[in-house]
C-alpha cells in the first residue's frame, strides 16, 4: 500500500489556445486531469489501472501552481494504491480549458482540451521527487512526482506491514526495509523476550521483563547462580540445590554436630595440647603447673608439701625450696640431726630411738602427720575422690571436683545422661557406661533420633529429558533441575521456538 | 491440534470467587509464542477481555477488573486459572479460556467451548 | 479507556457485499483482527493483523485498517456468513473488543 504524489509547478500557455488551436474565451481556465496505470510501452486510452484524480482550475493561461499539501492536500496530487507497488508506471496528464463550473467529462466538449503528456518508465519507492517538464507546440508543463509507502508499509515495494508496538505481543519499531528493530531490553522474533540482568544464569534464572532475574526453585542470588542448600543446613554447602555437605569439623545430616571442638572453642587454657575425642567432646593435656579440665587452674610446687620435718615451703619460678627448722638438712628436710633427747615430736606425738639413738621416729596422734607430727593429716592423700574426681583441701574439711558425667561428695553417683530427656521424636534412653543410645520409633533415626527418615522421593526417576533430582528432604517431595530447552516441574515441557515470520 | 478445556462450577453465590481451570491438551502451555487468556460474554452481550498470563508467570489484566482477578498458570499440569473475587449478578456470564499468538499481532486463533457461570444466591 | 465502535446490525442479500466497520482512534496504528460468532459457539478468528487470514478462512473474508477505521468486508455473501462480528485490538497491555455487529443475510 502507497501513493504515488504528483506536484504540479508550472503551466505555460502563453497564447491561451486549445489543442485545436482555437482560442479560449476570454482566456484557458485551466485545470487537470491525471490518469495513472500500468506500463506500457506505447501509453494507450484504457482503465486508469492504477487511479484517477482531477484538480479544480488552478489558473488561466499561464501560471505557477502553489504548494497547497498543508492546505487540503491539492498538490502534490495524491494517487493512493492498495497493491504491491511494481517499480513500473505509466502516466498521462490533461489540462482542459473549463468554460463553466461543471468540471465533470461528460459536461465539457471534447474540444475543450488544452494539452496531453503520457509518459512511462520505472520508479522505485522513496523520498526523492523526480522533476519532469514537457513541452508540446504551444505549452509547457513542469512536475515532478514520487511514490512512496502508506503509514506503516515498507520495503522497496510497500507491500510490507509492520506496525511499532511496545506491549507484551511485541517491543519493537519498523525498520525502512519493514524489519522489526527491538526496544532496547527486549529480544526475539517478535521482540516479546527480555534480555534478562547481565549473567543471569541460562538455566537457573529468568525474567519477565529486561535487566531481571528471576530464580527457579533451588537457587538464589542476583545471578542465580548460588544453589538453595538443605533447609537447616547450619555449617555445610551445597553445588547443587537441597544439597548440605559439611565444612570441615563438622556432621550430621544438617552439619550442626561438631567434630572438632578443639579448633571451633578453644577450651584448653595456658598453653594446653587440646585433643578431639568425639562429638562436643574433648581432652585437655595440661603444661607442667596446670591442672583442671581446662587447665584453668595453676598449680603450687608446694601444695603437694614437699617439705619435712616442719620445713616451710617456698615458690620459685623454677620450683621449690624448702627453709629446714633447726636440727634439719637436705632438699626437703628429710636429714636429722636431733634425738628423742631434743624433744622432736610435735603435737603430742611419742619418740622412739632407732639406731642406738642416732635416730629416731615420731608417732603421731590422729589427725597429725609428718616425720616430727608436724602437719595436720592432708585429707586428699587417701585419694578419696572417686571416678577420677579432683580432691581439694577447705581448710577442715575436702570437696571432691567431680568429671563430667559423676556427682555425688565423693563423685562416686553416674549422672543418668536419659536425664535430660535427650531421645527425640518418643525415643527410648538407655544409659550406658559411657554415655547414652537412643533407641527410635519408625520413621526416626539417628543418634538422638533427631533425622525424620524420608522417602527418596527421586526413586521414581520423576524427572523428564535428563532433568537432574534433587530429593527435599525436609517436605518428602522432589525437585528437577531442567537443562536448557525445558520446563515445567518435570522438565517435561521443551520450550518452543516462535514460529517463522509470516512475511 | 491444540485444545482448550474450560472447567469449573457453574453456580456460585454473590460475595464469593468465582474459580475456573483451562486444561491445555495437544501442545505445551510454555511456548514462548502464546499467551493464555481469559474473556467472558455475558446473556446477549458482547465479549470482553479478563486477561492473560504467560508461562513465566507474567499477567496482564483489563483495568476494570484487575482490583478482583488473579490469573495463574501450572506449567506441571499444563493448565492455567481464573479467579474472580467479590463476585455479583453482573459477573453472570459465558467465560472462554483461548490463546493468544505473538505470530498473529495477538489474535487468538483457538478457543475453548465456554462454560456458563451464573452468580445467583 | 480505549473503546472501539462497530455499528449494531449489517443486513446484505446473498451474493453481495457486507462491509463492517470498527473505529477507535488511530486503530490504523494498531492490529486490528475479527472474529466471527455464530449463537451458541465459541468466537472464530477471520482476520488477524487487519488483513490477514488464517489457514480455512473463505478468500470472501478481507479486511483492511488505516486511520481511525478497520473494514471487514465480505464478499459474495453467503447465508452460512450470518452471525456477530467483532473486532478487537491490543491497546498498550489491554485487549480490546468492539461491541459487535449482527450480520443478517436476507
Known amino acids: 500500500s502507497g501513493v504515488f504524489q504528483l506536484q504540479l509547478q508550472e503551466f505555460i500557455n502563453e497564447r491561451g489556445v486549445l489543442a485545436s488551436g482555437r482560442p479560449c474565451e476570454p482566456g484557458c481556465r485551466t485545470f487537470f486531469r491525471v490518469c495513472l496505470k500500468h506500463f506500457q510501452a506505447v501509453v494507450s486510452p484504457g482503465p486508469c489501472t492504477f487511479g484517477t484524480v482531477s484538480t479544480p482550475v488552478l489558473g488561466t493561461n499561464s501560471f505557477a501552481v502553489r504548494d497547497d499539501s498543508s492546505g487540503g492536500g491539492r498538490n502534490p496530487l495524491q494517487l493512493p494504491f492498495n497493491f504491491t507497488w511494481p517499480g513500473t508506471f505509466s502516466l498521462i496528464i490533461e489540462a482542459w480549458h473549463a468554460p463553466g463550473d461543471d468540471l465533470r467529462p461528460e459536461a465539457l466538449p471534447p474540444d475543450a482540451l488544452i494539452s496531453k503528456i503520457a509518459i512511462q518508465g520505472s520508479l522505485a519507492v522513496g523520498q526523492n521527487w523526480l522533476l519532469d517538464e514537457q513541452t508540446s507546440t504551444l505549452t509547457r508543463l513542469r512536475y515532478s512526482y514520487r511514490v512512496i509507502c502508506s503509514d506503516n508499509y515498507y520495503g522497496d515495494n510497500c507491500s510490507r506491514l509492520c506496525k511499532k508496538r511496545n506491549d507484551h505481543f511485541g517491543h519493537y519499531v519498523c525498520q525502512p526495509d519493514g524489519n522489526l528493530s527491538c526496544l532496547p531490553g527486549w529480544t526475539g522474533e517478535y521482540c516479546q523476550q527480555p534480555i534478562c540482568l547481565s549473567g543471569c544464569h541460562e538455566q537457573n534464572g529468568y525474567c519477565s521483563k529486561p535487566a531481571e532475574c528471576l530464580c527457579r526453585p533451588g537457587w538464589q542470588g542476583r545471578l542465580c547462580n548460588e544453589c538453595i542448600p538443605h533447609n537447616g543446613c547450619r555449617h555445610g554447602t551445597c553445588s547443587t540445590p537441597w544439597q548440605c555437605t559439611c565444612d570441615e569439623g563438622w556432621g550430621g545430616l544438617f552439619c550442626d554436630q561438631d567434630l572438632n571442638y578443639c579448633t571451633h572453642h578453644s577450651p584448653c587454657k595456658n598453653g594446653a595440647t587440646c585433643s578431639n575425642s568425639g562429638q562436643r567432646s574433648y581432652t585437655c593435656t595440661c603444661r607442667p603447673g596446670y591442672t583442671g579440665v581446662d587447665c584453668e587452674l595453676e598449680l603450687s610446687e608446694c601444695d603437694s608439701n614437699p617439705c619435712r620435718n616442719g620445713g616451710s615451703c617456698k615458690d620459685q619460678e623454677d620450683g621449690y625450696h624448702c627453709l629446714c627448722p633447726p636440727g634439719y638438712y637436705g632438699l626437703h628436710c628429710e636429714h636429722s640431726t636431733l634425738s628423742c633427747a631434743d624433744s622432736p615430736c610435735f603435737n603430742g606425738g611419742s619418740c622412739r630411738e632407732r639406731n642406738q639413738g642416732a635416730n629416731y621416729a615420731c608417732e603421731c596422734p590422729p589427725n597429725f602427720t609428718g616425720s616430727n607430727c608436724e602437719k595436720k593429716v592432708d585429707r586428699c592423700t587417701s585419694n578419696p575422690c572417686a571416678n577420677g574426681g579432683q580432691c581439694l583441701n577447705r581448710g577442715p574439711s575436702r570437696m571432691c571436683r567431680c568429671r563430667p558425667g559423676f556427682t555425688g561428695t565423693y563423685c562416686e553417683l553416674h549422672v543418668s545422661d536419659c536425664a535430660r530427656n535427650p531421645c527425640a521424636h518418643g525415643g527410648t534412653c538407655h544409659d550406658l557406661e559411657n554415655g547414652l543410645m537412643c533407641t527410635c520409633p519408625a520413621g526416626f533415626s539417628g543418634r538422638r533420633c533427631e533425622v525424620r527418615t524420608s522417602i527418596d522421593a527421586c526413586a521414581s526417576s520423576p524427572c523428564f529429558n535428563r532433568a537432574t533430582c534433587y530429593t527435599d528432604l525436609s517436605t518428602d517431595t522432589f525437585v528437577c533441575n531442567c537443562p536448557y530447552g525445558f520446563v515445567g516441574s518435570r522438565c517435561e515441557f521443551p520450550v518452543g521456538l516462535p514460529p517463522s515470520f509470516p512475511w | 491440534e491444540v485444545q482448550l478445556q474450560e472447567s469449573g462450577p457453574g453456580l456460585v453465590k454473590p460475595s464469593e470467587t468465582l474459580s475456573l481451570t483451562c486444561t491445555v491438551s495437544g501442545g505445551s502451555i510454555s511456548s514462548s509464542s502464546y499467551y493464555w487468556g481469559w474473556i467472558r460474554q455475558p446473556p446477549g452481550k458482547g465479549l470482553e477481555w479478563i486477561g492473560d498470563i504467560y508461562y513465566t508467570g507474567s499477567t496482564y489484566y483489563n483495568p476494570s477488573l484487575k482490583s478482583r482477578v488473579t490469573i495463574s498458570v501450572d506449567t506441571s499440569k499444563n493448565q492455567f486459572s481464573l479467579k474472580l473475587s467479590s463476585v455479583t449478578a453482573a459477573d453472570t456470564a459465558v467465560y472462554y479460556c483461548a490463546r493468544f499468538d505473538v505470530s498473529l499481532g495477538g489474535g487468538s486463533d483457538t478457543w475453548g467451548q465456554g462454560t456458563l457461570v451464573t452468580v445467583s444466591s | 479507556s480505549y473503546e472501539l465502535t462497530q455499528p449494531p446490525s449489517v443486513s446484505v442479500s446473498p451474493g453481495q457485499t457486507a462491509s463492517i466497520t470498527c473505529s477507535g482512534q488511530?486503530?490504523?496504528?494498531?492490529?486490528a483482527s475479527w472474529y466471527q460468532q455464530k449463537p451458541g459457539q465459541s468466537p472464530v478468528l477471520v482476520i488477524y493483523e487487519d488483513s490477514k487470514r488464517p489457514s480455512g478462512i473463505p478468500e470472501r473474508f478481507s479486511g483492511s485498517n488505516s486511520g481511525d477505521t478497520a473494514t471487514l468486508t465480505i464478499s459474495g455473501t453467503q447465508p452460512m456468513d450470518e452471525a456477530d462480528y467483532y473486532c478487537q485490538a491490543w491497546d498498550r497491555d489491554t485487549g480490546v473488543f468492539g461491541y459487535g455487529t449482527k450480520v443478517t443475510v436476507l
Open positions: 488511530r486503530l490504523g496504528d494498531k492490529y
